[in-house]
């Protein structure tokens, strides 16, 4: 039975040219996290394997930095980076948990963080 929940940074906004940290946290389960995949719609951004380390997709290697922790840092943001991002937690024995973050990249300097929310 999957008892865990994923807490994410929720809906966030950031300035064009700036950077943002995408962060998820898995709680309420003793399952072992074996891997976290970071994906944007149909694209793979990065993989963090608990044992083997990080894989960064070459399409994003100049703009994505691993961490902090299991999170992902997006740099040199463009308006095209606006959209949904998913953290996919592969765990044993529970299986897969998915968290969603919506990022809006703004032209203006008015960029405020949204509230945190949970996805069961």
């Amino acid at each position: 039975m999957m008892t865990g929940t994923i807490e994410t940074t929720g809906n966030i906004s950031a300035e064009k040219g700036g950077s943002i940290i995408l962060q998820c946290h898995l709680s309420s389960t003793t399952a072992q996290v074996t891997q976290v995949n970071w994906e944007q719609q149909d694209q793979l951004l990065a993989i963090c394997n608990a044992d083997l380390g990080w894989h960064i997709s070459p399409s994003f290697k100049d703009r994505v930095a691993p961490g902090p922790g299991l999170g992902l840092t997006l740099q040199s943001l463009t308006v095209n980076d606006t959209g949904e991002y998913f953290c996919i937690y592969h765990t044993y024995p529970d299986g897969t948990y998915t968290g969603r973050i919506f990022l809006e990249v703004l032209e203006s300097s008015v960029a405020e963080h949204g509230a945190r929310f949970q996805i069961p």
Partner: antibody
Amino acid sequence: QVQLVQSGAEVKKPGASVKVSCKASGFTFTEYTMHWVRQAPGQGLEWIGGFNPNSGGSSYNQKFKGRATLTVDKSISTAYMELSRLRSDDTAVYYCARSSYYRFDLDYWGQGTTVTVSS
Amino acid sequence: DIQMTQSPSSLSASVGDRVTITCKASQDVKTAVAWYQQKPGKAPKLLIYSASFRYTGVPSRFSGSGSGADFTLTISSLQPEDFATYYCQQHYLTPWTFGQGTKVEIK
């Protein structure tokens, strides 16, 4: 230049163990994950597992968990793969390979070590 | 485990031919696929990584495409040194798995 040089061919009896070594040179050993892949005669490639010398973490194909042990000696930039309780179907060429920095493909391979299990 | 199924398992072609090898994953693996070339008695060599990126020193006649579950390796004009066996590999999830191989033979 990057080189992965493996130990020589081995002939073992069923039930025995074998330890294959892979000496790395031409790159910073601790910054790359070392993997082991085997190929039975006339067959395809099978991933055994990988060892990250930086973190000390290792990931195994469940098929080999409990029989395969991956280790490294950082002082001599050498990776090892030990396979115990050998069976005849473990007869194969065993390759070490390096995964690229921040990539999970295998960009450099050793020359292979033939392990023959026969009574 | 994720299964990688290559087709065809073997093919005969002539120098100068355009050759296409396909690889189908049993589930979505995004672009986490590499292609290798192996010649008899030798270790595999990396050709393509992350589905479509040509590895350093690999001739431009080799190209990779696809995402999700369907991937293709194309050799635009087969050369004598290209007769070999080709493998796809997924690294989306451990255990990493390979296709069964496609042997490209001289017609």
